[in-house]
Amino acid sequence: QSPIFGPQDVSSIEGNSVSITCYYPDTSVNRHTRKYWCRQGANGYCATLISSNGYLSKEYSGRASLINFPENSTFVINIAHLTQEDTGSYKCGLGTTNRGLFFDVSLEVSQVPEFPNDTHVYTKDIGRTVTIECRFKEGNAHSKKSLCKKRGEACEVVIDSTEYVDPSYKDRAILFMKGTSRDIFYVNISHLIPSDAGLYVCQAGEGPSADKNNADLQVLEPEPELLYKDLRSSVTFECDLGREVANDAKYLCRKNKETCDVIINTLGKRDPAFEGRILLTPRDDNGRFSVLITGLRKEDAGHYQCGAHSSGLPQEGWPVQAWQLFVNEESTIPNSRSVVKGVTGGSVAIVCPYNPKESSSLKYWCHWEADENGRCPVLVGTQALVQEGYEGRLALFDQPGSGAYTVILNQLTTQDSGFYWCLTDGDSRWRTTIELQVAEATKKPDLEVTPQNATAVIGETFTISCHYPCKFYSQEKYWCKWSNDGCHILPSHDEGARQSSVSCDQSSQIVSMTLNPVKKEDEGWYWCGVKEGQVYGETTAIYVAVEERTRGSPHINPTDANARAKDAPEEEAMESSVREDENKANLDPRLFADEREIQNAGDQAQENRASGNAGSAGGQSGSSK
């Protein structure tokens, strides 16, 4: 008695696919050991055709796969494009050899059935239209024409030329002649349903001189396409239902017992379980559309169907396409926070994982909008300008080699609440969904900038301070200048870091930045933030306005400014005296380079290492893109 279980007999027809599930006992060893599918030879030897170690035999090349589902203790063998040569005895099993634990499976592949010579076979999918062609001799040109369906010995009339239509074919069947043709009539049956399948007889005339034709109608249920996706990845259902339903509402539904529950349709219906992680996109004017679901969960596995009907709901006799989605829990996509919470006026740092093998891919962040089909306009990207309304408060920090990038959004308002997607132009499976929840702030923000009314005067020295609480004592503090392509880290000086680590005076933890001398191009948004290595934390933003010195205003020289800064105990401002260098050398030239060259993992890793020192106790500073 084998502990492995599966289907003992599998039967299909040529050209079809089979999906064979083998069940194994739920043990750690079984979950991780080799899985195989082999063909039993007459000599007792079982020749491996495919295994979970990556082996694929020549005869299965391009048409078979083996997928392990450890969380279900199953593995699935898919074989497509079956031929009669595939008929035989097989084993599905576990172990390093093909003699371990196994289960015997018999596969029988038959020819597509043939019919008598005078029978025309029509094969159509559910919901489609069939046109049955009926030939007759000239002698029956003016005789009654009819189509009937065989039920046992009887043949029940479906439609005839006297305008009779069987009630079950009402509004679906029409009998017509084309042009001047005197020897053929046609019967169209639309919105085909499974019970329409069977043998039909068309007839012109009565009695022994009647002309008869046999037609065998096969109505095919949609063969589900098998989709295997990792937990937390995304899936796209590509739906092509044909021109005849191009103008009807489209839907995607999930089969549940005898119903199919609509997940999304083009009339604005959407299942709350997919809120924030689904998009329906029309592909062309011929009725093609796709549905993308991100952040796949275990419970998303199941049978899906797309279709079209004016109601936006599944309707018998309308075309459908089917899929079976499997969700593999052994995912390469890391588990990241699905909900991020922030407060008004505060900030959030969202970590977006991406395929580490694609560090040069372009990264994006978009805001999912719940219009009728769902859409996700890009707010920021490695080569996309920050969207209007997000200037000065949104930036994307790439961290090449780490398999993640960070998006920071500050000056939060409750309108920022909603769903956001992390995506790249590379591996589409790595789309992740984050729900941002912004609540009203109940206390002062952790980071505060002084002066809050920041106006700098050209040619003078301008110092801006960022006060941080003791809880950020051990973290790196930085200042950066926001621009449309990121927030570039500036030299700054952290006062709190110079204190003894034994005590922490809540009132005197300051990181300051000095512009000396102020230039017109210094105008803009500046961020004060904290981070630990490549993990970004809280930020706050301030807009620094720059104005010409008005006549009569006192000129404060840099030393006075420094002296004034020194009046505040524990605070020692560090000026940007190497202003020319900073503006020229430290701005990343690749920001203006060709699109293909914009990402260079090596360089950027260097850059991030440099910025890691900004504001450290030794007074070192660095700048980064």
């Epitope: 289907p7 599998v10 696919s17 089979v18 069940y23 063969e223 005898e258 049978h303």
Partner: nanobody, 126 residues
């Protein structure tokens, strides 16, 4: 809803054959698999055999205890599943239930089936 009606049970001698039928009506289009379970007095309901399908492909599953003796088949046009039982043994005595499922993860698990018939008694005397 799907309604299932079993027939063909009865009293037979050990070694004899019997053919059970299960006719499905209602929304049968949504079914994905149909099978047979049995329950002997004082015992748990036990998996016997199941047939699942996808288009023109059929998958037949059997319990070890009936392999080689029982055969499941279906007539698509009649929405009927048959269980041909050969070489019957006294151990096969039980009430045989027909079950249907819309989505099946493991055909051996009774809770995976959405619809059940009333059952038909099979008694095998020695």
């Amino acid at each position: 809803q799907v309604q299932l009606v079993e027939s063909g049970g009865g009293l037979v001698q050990a070694g004899d054959s019997l053919r059970l039928s299960c006719a499905a009506s209602g929304r049968t289009r949504t079914t994905y698999g149909m099978g047979w379970f049995r329950q002997a007095p004082g015992k748990e309901r036990e998996f016997v055999t199941t047939i699942t399908w996808s288009g023109s492909t059929n998958y037949k599953y059997y319990a070890d205890s009936v392999k080689g003796r029982f055969t499941i088949s279906r007539d698509n046009a009649k929405n009927t599943v048959y269980l041909q039982m050969n070489s019957l043994k006294p151990d096969d005595t039980a009430v045989y239930y027909c079950a249907a499922s819309t989505v099946l993860t493991d055909p051996r698990v009774p809770t995976e089936y959405d619809y059940w018939g009333q059952g038909t008694q099979v008694t095998v005397s020695s």
